[in-house]
């Protein structure tokens, strides 16, 4: 066959679907690879062809669209399973072509089993709620396009294994789940089960997401440098190791880049000829506030190094701060026989 622009296996879109549930999968060509949509392609006389490779096989085979009850079908640029089976797992390819043009992409589809408490190997999206922030909602994800707006599905919400009924601060409202005031105790996995009829059959869509309660923007502050501070003096003799920790607390801020860096005499440590190493560690609180520690280390400090300015800097979306470490050279203790004796008037 003639040359085809092959975008390869698009592992960035590892699609996971539950066994025995409907799944609608759009051909990724139009979403991520080509500059035109399906309608334009179709009206230009291009045809969309689907095929697949079963799990642990190398052989590409056509998809059987003649299964009972149209279990697998194609509609425009969407491949439909009504419902999926475990052995539908494999790599699926959509190819757009006519006599002069060809483009194709493959993507992995994994059909996943779940237990009665909705536990499964499915990768779960995380939804962050601000702690004690007033009413916040989560919405049952990825259910658009499964049924027409004229169909009114039933939606049941679960926290873990338990149906959400008469919960103190969590109220199901159809496709939405409202948290009246989010608390740490609301952390966990939430599942919506959407049930709808189609052609005399009943289908279920199961969607699970993880709720993580995080620090509220109402309580967010600029970075706080705990160390270095004015109470600690790093007093060293030449030849000793100088270790200065910079410990910074960052409030949780959605999509904020937290950064900590040292300057030595106003320069990036790499830019000056000192044998300096910097090691970083990061820890998080239950509400995802962050504490970063960068330890600046000079193995054998010189008297020149002890005169330098060591400043820790920190920045988040809330602001930038800096703090200098107090570094000084230790005054050697007097040698009794000479210095002290002279002090007593000995000659």
């Amino acid at each position: 066959s003639e040359r085809c622009d092959d975008w390869g296996l698009d592992t960035m879109r590892q699609i996971q679907v539950f066994e025995d549930e409907p799944a609608r999968i759009k051909c990724p060509l139009f979403e991520h690879f080509l500059k035109f949509n399906y309608s334009t392609a179709h009206s230009a006389g291009l045809t969309l062809i689907w095929y697949w490779t079963r799990q642990d096989r190398d052989l590409e085979e056509p998809i059987n669209f003649r299964l009972p009850e149209n279990r697998i079908s194609k509609e425009k640029d969407v491949l439909w399973f009504r419902p999926t089976l475990l052995n539908d797992t494999g790599n699926y390819t959509c190819m757009l072509r006519n006599t002069t043009y060809c483009s194709k992409v493959a993507f992995p589809l994994e059909v996943v089993q779940k237990d009665s408490c909705f536990n499964s190997p499915m990768k779960l999206p995380v939804h962050k709620l601000y702690i004690e922030y007033g009413i916040q909602r989560i919405t049952c994800p990825n259910v658009d396009g499964y049924f027409p707006s004229s169909v009114k599905p039933t939606i049941t919400w679960y926290m873990g294994c338990y149906k959400i009924q008469n919960f103190n601060n969590v109220i199901p409202e159809g496709m939405n789940l409202s948290f009246l005031i989010a608390l740490i105790s609301n952390n966990g996995n939430y599942t919506c089960v959407v049930t709808y009829p189609e052609n005399g059959r009943t289908f279920h869509l199961t969607r699970t997401l993880t709720v993580k309660v995080v620090g509220s923007p109402k309580n967010a502050v600029p970075p706080v440098i705990h160390s270095p501070n004015d109470h600690v003096v790093y007093e060293k003799e030449p030849g000793e190791e100088l270790l200065i920790p910079c410990t910074v607390y960052f409030s949780f801020l959605m999509d904020s880049r937290n950064e900590v860096w040292w300057t030595i005499d106003g320069k990036k440590p790499d830019d000056i000829t000192i044998d300096v190493t910097i090691n970083e560690s990061i820890s998080h609180s239950r509400t995802e506030d962050e504490t970063r520690t960068q330890i600046l280390s000079i193995k054998k400090v010189t008297s020149e190094d002890l005169k330098r300015s060591y400043v820790c800097h920190a920045r988040s979306a809330k602001g930038e701060v800096a703090k200098a470490a107090k570094v000084k050279q230790k005054v050697p203790a007097p040698r009794y026989t000479v210095e002290l004796a002279c002090g007593f008037g000995a000659t």
């Epitope: 300057t263 106003g266 320069k267 000056i272 020149e304 005169k307 300015s309 200098a324």
Partner: antibody
Framework: QVQLVQSGAEVKKPGSSVKVSCKAS????????MNWVRQAPGQGLEWMGQ????????YYNEKFKDRVTITVDKSTSTAYMELSSLRSEDTAVYYC?????????????????WGQGTLVTVSS | DIQMTQSPSSLSASVGDRVTITCRAS??????LAWYQQKPGKAPKLLIH???SLAEGVPSRFSGSGSGTDFTLTISSLQPEDFATYYC?????????FGQGTKLEIK
């Protein structure tokens, strides 16, 4: 606002020394590098050296290393550049210029504020 | 020491023109490059630092690009006040070097 005010023009004999001052105001003097740059008549810019006032650390252009000394007086927020063994080719406008401390976001040490320049003429 | 080479050394252009000046470093300087404008009898003025960050108060017709060894200053539409000499400078490590300058003259 940030200001760098330099001392007045100087006329010097070959073999002598010159000391140019640069008084800083409108920012925290100790935490920014102070650079010295010169420009001979009709020529380009030439970096001479820099000092970090908080610690007194200084770096010099190899070309001037033996003849130039940069110092600061923290109490008056003033930087000084002394050039010794003057020759006629040292006739130039001498500028002081501030450069910021390194920032993770803004990168290195661009010269963001400049003095008005001091003309030093070396002539016998 | 890192050498900075600017081109062209001079160029003539008209008001409204798009102008490009290039600067090449003798070794990689990451994005540590600044551009300055100097008018006769005046101190240089910082236009761009860190290769593409516009300095405070500089009009948006000035832009910088590049990283590693090759850098460009572009003036999208020349204004009468833009006729001057332009210098690049690497601001990296413990020594700073300027390019030899590009004189931008009215055609």
């Amino acid at each position: 606002q940030v200001q760098l005010v330099q001392s007045g023009a100087e006329v010097k004999k070959p073999g002598s020394s010159v000391k140019v001052s640069c008084k800083a105001s409108g920012y925290i003097f100790l935490t920014y590098w102070m650079n010295w740059v010169r420009q001979a008549p009709g020529q380009g810019l030439e970096w001479m050296g820099q000092i970090f006032p908080a610690s007194g650390s200084a770096y010099y252009n190899e070309k001037f290393k033996d003849r130039v000394t940069i110092t600061v007086d923290k109490s008056t927020s003033t930087a000084y550049m002394e050039l010794s063994s003057l020759r006629s080719e040292d006739t130039a406008v001498y500028y002081c210029a501030r450069s910021g401390p390194y920032s993770y976001y803004a990168g290195g040490y661009a010269l963001d504020y400049w003095g008005q320049g001091t003309l030093v003429t070396v002539s016998s | 020491d890192i050498q900075m080479t600017q081109s062209p050394s001079s160029l003539s252009a008209s008001v409204g023109d798009r102008v490009t000046i290039t600067c090449r470093a003798s070794q990689s300087i990451s994005s540590y490059l600044a551009w300055y404008q100097q008018k006769p009898g005046k101190a240089p003025k910082l236009l761009i630092h860190y290769a593409k960050s516009l300095a405070e108060g500089v009009p948006s017709r000035f832009s910088g690009s590049g990283s590693g060894t090759d850098f460009t200053l572009t003036i999208s539409s020349l204004q009468p006040e833009d006729f001057a000499t332009y210098y690049c400078q690497h601001h990296y490590g413990t020594s700073l070097t300027f390019g030899q300058g590009t004189k931008l003259e009215i055609k």
